[in-house]
């Protein structure tokens, strides 16, 4: 008789999930020799231990603590780039500006980027059929709790000037319900962080509006100011040119506004 399986609303665990996590760990430690002390098999065991045999709507940050401990990593606290709804450009930027780091440039962020995973209560199986959706099923699911945990720790580690890339093409440029708006903003430490600088990325070629005046950016400024952190905002009118100028800052066209 086939066992009854909970049917969730979200996609199931990414295929080859264990192999992918282990492979990513090896690749990461290969090109980040400062992380060579990490035992990738232990990392996978800790990752697995966070969600296997547990109800996928009852995951806590404590479940991920063994993994967090193994993945402890020091990044320059004044070189942190946060992002919201504009991941690809943020990653293209840190690929060029190698001294700056997004969460996905750290081991733990890299391991989980774009992956989905969940288990089942009381069985050691990984659920490849479906996993809980944050909205339709539950918020305390393995993926959401993981990103909440690592995002909080990443924000807590930040110091001096912290940058955030925001998508100017969206109706809510700053969204209080995003990971940035609900987790990272509230875990920046005012005693360490002097300024949050927002980079609002324009989508349209002819879009010359000052999106730093957008009501949601004003809302972000208000939240940040109440936390005794300075706020500044820049429009990035031409993201393609912006990246090109990061690559070649001496280019004569890079003195004008981008």
């Amino acid at each position: 008789v086939p066992r009854w399986r909970q049917q969730w609303s979200g996609p199931g665990t990414t295929k080859r999930f264990p192999e992918t996590v282990l492979a990513r760990c090896v690749k990461y430690t290969e090109i980040h020799p400062e992380m060579r002390h990490v035992d990738c098999q232990s990392v996978w065991d800790a990752f697995k231990g966070a969600f296997i045999s547990k109800h996928p709507c009852n995951i806590t940050e404590e479940d991920y603590q063994p993994l967090m401990k193994l993945g402890t990593q020091t990044v320059p606290c004044n070189k942190i780039l946060l992002w919201s709804r504009i991941k690809d450009l943020a990653h293209q930027f840190t690929q060029v500006q190698r001294d700056m780091f997004t969460l996905e440039d750290t081991l733990l962020g890299y391991l989980a980027d774009d992956l989905t995973w969940c288990g089942e209560f009381n069985t050691s199986k990984i659920n490849y059929q479906s996993c809980p959706d944050w909205r339709k099923d539950c918020s305390n699911n393995p993926v959401s709790v993981f990103w909440k945990t690592v995002s909080r720790r990443f924000a807590e580690a930040a110091c001096d000037v912290v940058h955030v890339m925001l998508n100017g093409s969206r109706s809510k440029i700053f969204d209080k319900n995003s990971t940035f708006g609900s987790v990272e903003v509230h875990n920046l430490q005012p005693e360490k962080v002097q300024t949050l600088e927002a980079w609002v990325i324009h989508g349209g070629r002819e879009d010359s509006r000052d999106l730093c005046q957008d009501p949601t950016i004003k809302e972000l400024e208000s939240i940040i100011s109440k936390r005794n952190i300075q706020f500044s905002c820049k429009n990035i009118y031409r993201p393609d040119k912006f990246l090109q100028c990061v690559k070649n800052p001496e280019d004569s066209s890079c003195t004008s506004e981008i």
Epitope: R16, E19, T20, A23, R24, V26, K27, E30, I31, P33, R36, H37, H91, Q95, D113
Partner: antibody, heavy 118, light 112 residues
């Protein structure tokens, strides 16, 4: 069986660009970094850089920044290296090499000879 | 960059006897995790290089146990206990403790 099949020899003029390929088979392409190594005229080996096929992240030897560009096409499990502004110094055999679990270059392509001559 | 130094040629050896090839690094290749990130490759005439030894002393898959390697953090030796004709080629040491990864100049094994 793991295989890395590289494209054929190239003869290019100074100032031109060349793009050589390395088609991987016999393993999950995104699971390992792909490296590129230069061997000039029977001399020693120089590591150019590597690429993570999973998301395209690259790491370069500073010496080859601006000279080499590494890319991948996940759909065909192929890694590419483009060399620009070719000079006679770029005449060499170029190898692709797949890293292994303990980081050594476990599998190598057969090499692609690039000759730069006016 | 870490510089790997090798003699261009080995002392000529007779088939069936042992041979040693040396390599020196400009910096210790011993990581705080206890692993020494030193590798040995052999390039036979007309072929691509092949991995012989990884992490200083581990034999790569398919490599005969006539090959062994030892060393400190900066001085390393590859030993071939009973040299065979098929061992002829250039032996390269390499490090991947630090970027950029670097190779030695190679040592050509000479047969008497």
């Amino acid at each position: 069986e793991v295989q890395l099949q590289q494209s054929g020899p190239e003869l290019e003029k100074p100032g031109a660009s060349v793009k050589i390929s390395c088609k991987a088979s016999g393993y999950s392409f995104t699971d390992y970094n792909m490296n590129w190594v230069k061997q000039s005229n029977g001399k020693s080996l120089e590591w150019i850089g590597n690429i993570d096929p999973d998301y395209g992240g690259t790491t370069y030897n500073q010496k080859f920044k601006g000279k080499a560009t590494l890319t991948v096409d996940k759909s065909s499990s192929t890694a590419y290296m483009q060399l620009r502004s070719l000079t006679s110094e770029d005449s060499a055999v170029y190898y692709c090499a797949r890293s292994g679990y303990r980081y050594g270059f476990v599998y190598w392509g057969q090499g692609t000879l690039v000759t730069v001559s006016a | 960059d870490i510089v790997m130094t090798q003699a261009a040629f080995s002392n000529p050896v007779t088939l069936g006897t042992s041979a040693s090839i040396s390599c020196r690094s400009s910096k210790s290749l011993l990581h705080s995790n206890g692993i020494t990130y030193l590798y040995w490759y052999l390039q036979k005439p007309g072929q691509s290089p092949q991995l012989l030894i990884y992490q200083m002393s581990n034999l790569a898959s398919g490599v005969p146990d006539r090959f062994s390697s030892s060393g400190s953090g900066t001085d390393f030796t590859l030993r071939i206990s009973r040299v065979e004709a098929e061992d002829v080629g250039v032996y390269y040491c390499a490090q991947n403790l630090e970027l950029p990864w670097t190779f030695g100049g190679g040592t050509k094994l000479e047969i008497k």
